[in-house]
Interface confidence: medium
């Protein structure tokens, strides 16, 4: 049997990188400069994202895909599609509203972003501290105290005396 053919939207033939131009009998026109269409059949092209100020261009806009931004050195991306740039800190610090602050004793941050996290409490796993923690590094847990040879000492850090992730102001 013969299938009834539906009237096809002429715009559906317009590929990515073009738009269906109503002003020109619905022919497919290329996207103007600084605009793109990432899918076919579009009636308009979208304006390209501009990476200005703290944002810098990671990928140029093309007729079929939007520009992609990242952040200028000293900042890192946050949010979908790098919608925001946040100030970096040094390892051993966290970003507060008052700027970069050193991690409190008992906490560490091994990255340029994020918050200070408490050192691992080795004793919770029945282990001892093999290497002490620093502002930049977590403690390294070793064998349990019972496994240590006689005379060996273990260092267990005191529990942090504050809520983790917040530096004193």
């Amino acid at each position: 049997f013969e299938r009834t053919r539906s009237l096809q939207d002429p715009c559906s033939n317009c590929p990515a990188g073009t738009f269906c131009d109503n002003n020109r009998n619905q022919i497919c026109s290329p996207c103007p400069p600084n605009s793109f269409s990432s899918a076919g059949g579009q009636r308009t092209c979208d304006i390209c994202r501009q990476c200005k100020g703290v944002f810098r261009t990671r990928k140029e806009c093309s007729s079929t895909s939007n520009a992609e931004c990242d952040c200028t050195p000293g900042f890192h991306c946050l949010g979908a599609g790098c919608s925001m740039c946040e100030q970096d800190c040094k390892q051993g610090q966290e970003l507060t509203k008052k700027g970069c602050k050193d991690c409190c004793f008992g906490t560490f941050n091994d990255q340029k972003r994020g918050i200070c996290r408490p050192w691992t409490n080795c004793s919770l796993d029945g282990k001892s501290v093999l290497v002490n923690g620093t502002k930049e590094r977590d403690v390294v847990c070793g064998p349990s105290p019972a496994d240590l040879s006689p005379g060996a000492s273990s260092v267990t850090p005191p529990a942090p005396a504050r809520e983790p992730g917040h530096s004193p102001q």
């Epitope: 100020g53 919608s83 740039c85």
Partner: antibody, heavy 122, light 107 residues
């Protein structure tokens, strides 16, 4: 493009209060952190305080603690800075400024309002 | 608070000159240093942020360098519209603090 337009010049007597407004256009106030900076005649620039919209926290310079109040009317996209117990040394141009859109705690100032001259004189 | 010291406090130069202004922080501020230009009766204008990043729309004759405690603003070829006062500002910690300014005058 963010634009900031401030209220007009004020003349106040010592002991009085002044409230300076800063109207935002181009973006909504809730998208921007807002800072206030003043400049005394022939002097340099002095940060007074900042408002961060992510969690509504306001930070004031120690020097102005107890005398400064920063508020926002988000429905009108307008920020306010009120300074009380005015003295002659508070005579200055007061600026509102924001950070580049999309910047979290970059703590640089751009763009700025045009400034509001506050004169404190008996 | 972190103190910012600019030098010189004023300088005289001619159109076309290369001009250098320095800014020193009282402690290390990494690269969190910004430069502003201010003309009489106008609000400051951001030129450089994060020590060396040129703000959109600012001419490329302006450049910034430095990290830690010592920073430099350079105008490679001074133009008539560049005669103004320049301020550095640290954004490393609160309170943000400014240098006292450098006035660039016509020789």
């Amino acid at each position: 493009e963010v634009q900031l337009v401030q209220s007009g010049a004020e003349v106040k007597k010592p002991g009085a209060s002044v409230k300076v407004s800063c109207k935002v256009s181009g973006y909504t106030l809730t998208e921007l952190s807002m800072h206030w900076v003043r400049q005394s005649p022939g002097k340099g620039l002095e940060w007074m305080g900042s408002f961060y919209p992510e969690d509504g926290e306001t930070i004031y310079a120690q020097k102005f603690q107890g005398r400064i109040t920063m508020t926002e009317d988000t429905s009108a996209d307008t920020a306010y800075m009120e300074l009380s117990s005015l003295r002659s040394e508070d005579t200055a141009v007061y600026y509102c400024a924001t950070e580049g859109v999309g910047v979290i705690r970059g703590n640089w100032f751009d763009p700025w309002g045009q400034g509001t001259l506050v004169t404190v004189s008996s | 608070d972190i103190q910012m010291t600019q030098s010189p406090s004023s300088l005289s130069a001619s159109v076309g000159d290369r001009v250098t202004i320095t800014c020193r922080a009282s402690q290390s501020i990494s690269s969190y240093l910004n430069w502003y230009q201010q003309k009489p009766g106008k609000a400051p204008k951001l030129l450089i942020y994060a020590a060396s990043s040129l703000q959109s729309g600012v001419p490329s004759r302006f450049s910034g360098s430095g990290s830690g405690t010592d920073f430099t603003l350079t105008i490679s070829s001074l133009q008539p519209e560049d005669f103004a006062t320049y301020y550095c500002q640290q954004s490393y910690s609160t309170p943000p603090t400014f240098g006292q300014g450098t006035k660039v005058e016509i020789k």
